[in-house]
Amino acid sequence: RDTTVKPGAKKDTKDSRPKLPQTLSRGWGDQLIWTQTYEEALYKSKTSNKPLMIIHHLDECPHSQALKKVFAENKEIQKLAEQFVLLNLVYETTDKHLSPDGQYVPRIMFVDPSLTVRADITGRYSNRLYAYEPADTALLLDNMKKALKLLKTEL
């Protein structure tokens, strides 16, 4: 789903059931530690020397919802995610490097501790390079492993 041109409000489709208080995980992995802002995430990535994984999504997007379920239920993904600084966002940041080919959701991007956006780590869709679908969990795992191999930075 492309969020560049926002369609009309979709409050009519919102689930009316009472929910537990929303945590920073927003359902992407309640046992994981999530950062609140992009700025905080960049700082933590740099100081901890851990790569940053950023998930852009929307509550009212069926593909965000579907990917969230497989992400949260996949034990390998959840285990590997512990090695990252984690951020999930339901809004766009001002950093254009995080939307090199558009502001669609869901999309997952990685940032090296050197604060380089890993635009080279892509999914399987040529028209939406950073999109992942539920069938793409193996590829996402591979890409997480790629991101853990940190870029060499000159001292």
Epitope: R1, P7, R17, P62, Q65, K69, E133, A135
Partner: antibody
Framework: QVQLLESGGGLVKPGGSLRLSCATS????????MNWIRQAPGQGLEWIGW????????NYNGKVKDRFTLSADKAKNSVYLQMNSLRAEDTAVYFC?????????????WGQGTLVTVSS | EIVLTQSPDFQSVTPKEKVTITCKAS??????LSWFQQKPDQSPKTLIY???RLVDGVPSRFSGSGSGQDFTLTINSLEAEDAATYYC?????????FGGGTKVEIK
Amino acid sequence: QVQLLESGGGLVKPGGSLRLSCATSGYVFSRSWMNWIRQAPGQGLEWIGWIYPGDGDTNYNGKVKDRFTLSADKAKNSVYLQMNSLRAEDTAVYFCARGGYDGSPWLSYWGQGTLVTVSS
Amino acid sequence: EIVLTQSPDFQSVTPKEKVTITCKASQDINSYLSWFQQKPDQSPKTLIYRANRLVDGVPSRFSGSGSGQDFTLTINSLEAEDAATYYCLQYDEFPFTFGGGTKVEIK
């Protein structure tokens, strides 16, 4: 193989309530989205909503949100559609349809449907 | 909500002929479109998902194409058993919406 079996349809008076069931088998129930779709006599198809049985998350078509409620019972591998304040225009065949086997949103398997008639 | 406009509404075709049904979305839906076949007094059967992926067990004479707003279902060499109503569905955005249907009749 995958099987979906709807039940609970029948004749109900305007303003009445009905609870439809969709019994499933042949796949991991908790990890596929389940949709409800209806088809008025001689008409096209209309999506009602979906539920993720693993945690009960739902989304509804705004047209029915205030009157219809989806739920799931993991012990019985069944999903339910509770319909309240029924109107004549709710008369239709109601289908449950499973999402993709991998958790994708596309509709992969359909039940045979159950007819709901709202009439006085 | 996203509106899907199917055309034609009705098509009368001779066996072995090629059938083309189009579905136009009111906005970009990427490739999140499915095609279904429904015969009288039966439930719909899924033929195609993600615009061009054939569901297991569906004959290869069925194919789908398109992305963005314009999509096509093609039946190469129509068979008598293909007489049915065909629907498209977008699942890019809530609420999911269906096209109005195309009835294919055998001459």
